[in-house]
């Protein structure tokens, strides 16, 4: 049976591991871990360094405030930025929106509204807990980097958990493993240690004994509901049949846009509609 | 650099048979999404005919008007085949070979093709 | 499916813009699951546009795609001599199974 957290321990933000209790995940705080935790301390530091205050200061950029509307994600050019629009959407800065409400856009239980204005064809009031346009994304909890020593932060929605660097482990890669130390992994494998030898545990995409070999990702057909799947460079990709939606297309969306996410599936983050 | 040749088209008999050979040098179909063929009659419009999943689980796709006379499979990392059955006049095109990709969550986006090989079916 | 392609053909003098449209029997996946190609005579086609409106690597900004659902259309703007070709929409769906289908195409002369 799952363990009954605190009463009002933020699903998002607090976990247990005994009944009754509500541990924070980083960047939070509070009885209930519903205080984000300040960040003038600079935690995530990017850009040239301000003398008065020690803290880095961003350099202005074409991406910068985000130039793409609806959810579109920015990435810079040699000239000037490239937006990538979300379903439904298109033009220069996704602006122009060729959905309504009837096409049910907003996922996650997100409540669709008709726009105003022409420009915005419908809008999404989001759920606590997600974001975007089309309350297509989780909030970020990797955000604030709380995986050590280069560890990859992964958000599976009830937990923030960190694949670590080969050499590290720990919940948050804190711990340097000497005993793999010059046994080092490819391609982003972890070194674990076992009876005196090391083994690679190896990233998604390689295997072998030390993750040198290139494995086929859609081997095992992970995309659910005659989901279409696409070997990627981050591992793999899968294209949903219209009806489903998540990383491998196993929650149904509902006719009113709505999905069958579970509250906190084990393992599982519900994604993207198509990746 | 990415390429692919098709070899084995030629003049075949009505209710004949014949294999198509897609080759790709440059690459690995493991790492490049879906391997399809499109055809083209002399004078005519492109047509899609099936597409096979670039990995190891042989995922197929065909035209509702392809399947039973046509066959797609992979026979290597880097060769795909296409095996045509009870061809008729009809079936006279050239027969493209393709590269499926997904780009920005959008799929069956053809963005490397062969030049072609040519099937004629007469008696 | 069906993706219907008009005009065909159609001409414009060098320098002036050809406009190209495709009109599908029903929505495509994603409603902007649709793609263009150029092609010439004695060539494989070329991908020139893919998601609706994303120009493919290569491919010069005149050429423009728009349109969501089941209207496209294709803008071909200061017209070179090189662009003269058959151009092609494609568009994907699923209806328990994936498949895709392509416009009868458009012959683009330049005068």
């Known amino acids: 049976a799952p363990l009954v957290c605190r009463a009002g321990c933020s699903p998002e933000h607090g976990f247990c591991e005994q009944p009754g209790e509500c541990r924070c995940l980083e960047g939070w705080t509070g009885p209930l871990c519903t205080v984000p935790v300040s960040t003038s301390s600079c935690l995530s530091p990017r850009g040239p360094s301000s003398a008065t205050t020690g803290c880095l200061v961003p350099g202005p950029g074409p991406c910068d405030g985000n130039p793409c509307a609806n959810g579109g994600s920015c990435s810079e050019t040699p000239r000037s930025f490239e937006c990538t629009c979300p379903r439904g959407f298109y033009g220069l800065r996704c602006e122009v929106s060729g959905v309504t409400c009837a096409d049910g856009p907003c996922f996650n239980g997100g409540l669709c509204v008709g726009g105003a204005d022409p420009d915005s064809a419908y809008i999404c009031h989001c759920p606590p807990g997600f974001q975007g346009s089309n309350c297509e994304k989780r909030v970020d909890r990797c955000s604030l980097q709380p995986c050590r020593n280069g560890g990859l932060c992964l958000d599976l929605g009830h937990a923030l958990r960190c694949r670590c660097r080969a050499g590290f482990a720990g919940p948050r890669c804190e711990h340097d493993l000497d005993d793999c130390a010059g046994r080092a992994c490819a391609n982003g494998g972890t070194c674990v240690e076992g009876g005196g030898a090391h083994r690679c545990s190896c990233a998604l995409g390689f295997g072998g004994r030390d993750c040198r070999e290139r494995a086929d990702p859609c081997a095992a057909r992970p995309c659910a509901h005659g989901g279409r799947c696409y070997a990627h460079f981050s591992g793999l990709v899968c294209a949903c049949a219209p009806g489903y939606m998540g990383a491998r297309c196993e929650f149904p969306v509902h006719p009113d846009g709505a999905s069958a996410l579970p509250a906190a599936p084990p393992g599982l983050r519900p994604g993207d509609p198509q990746r | 650099q990415e390429q692919l040749v098709e070899s084995g088209g030629g003049l075949v008999q009505p209710e004949g048979s014949l294999t198509l050979t897609c080759t790709a040098s440059?690459?690995?179909?493991?790492?490049?999404?879906?391997m399809c063929w499109v055809r083209q009659a002399p004078g005519k419009g492109l047509e899609w005919i099936a597409c096979?999943?670039?990995?190891?689980?042989?995922?197929t796709d065909y035209a509702n008007w392809a399947k039973g006379r046509f066959s797609i499979s992979k026979t290597s990392s880097t060769t795909v085949t296409l095996q045509m059955t009870s061809l008729t006049v009809a079936d006279t095109a050239t027969y493209f070979c393709?590269?499926?990709?997904?780009?920005?969550?959008?799929?069956?986006?053809?963005?490397?093709w062969g030049p072609g090989t040519l099937v004629t079916v007469s008696s | 499916q069906v993706l219907t392609q008009t005009p065909s053909p159609v001409s414009a003098a060098v320098g002036g813009t050809v406009t190209i449209s495709c009109q599908a029997s029903q929505s495509v996946y994603n409603n902007n699951n649709l793609a263009w190609y150029q092609q010439k005579p004695g060539q494989p086609p070329k991908l020139l546009i893919y998601a609706a409106s994303s120009l493919a690597s290569g491919v010069p900004s005149r050429f423009k795609g728009s349109g969501a659902g089941t209207q496209f259309t294709l803008t071909i703007s200061d017209l070179e001599c090189d662009d003269a070709a058959t151009y092609y929409c494609?568009?994907?769906?699923?209806?328990?199974?994936?498949?895709?289908?392509f416009g009868g195409g458009t012959e683009v002369v330049v005068k």
């Open positions: 440059g690459f690995s179909f493991s790492s490049s999404g879906y």
């Open positions: 096979i999943s670039g990995g190891s689980s042989g995922d």
């Open positions: 494609q568009g994907t769906y699923y209806s328990s199974g994936w498949y895709s289908t």
């Open positions: 393709a590269r499926d990709v997904y780009i920005d969550s959008t799929i069956f986006n053809f963005n490397l």
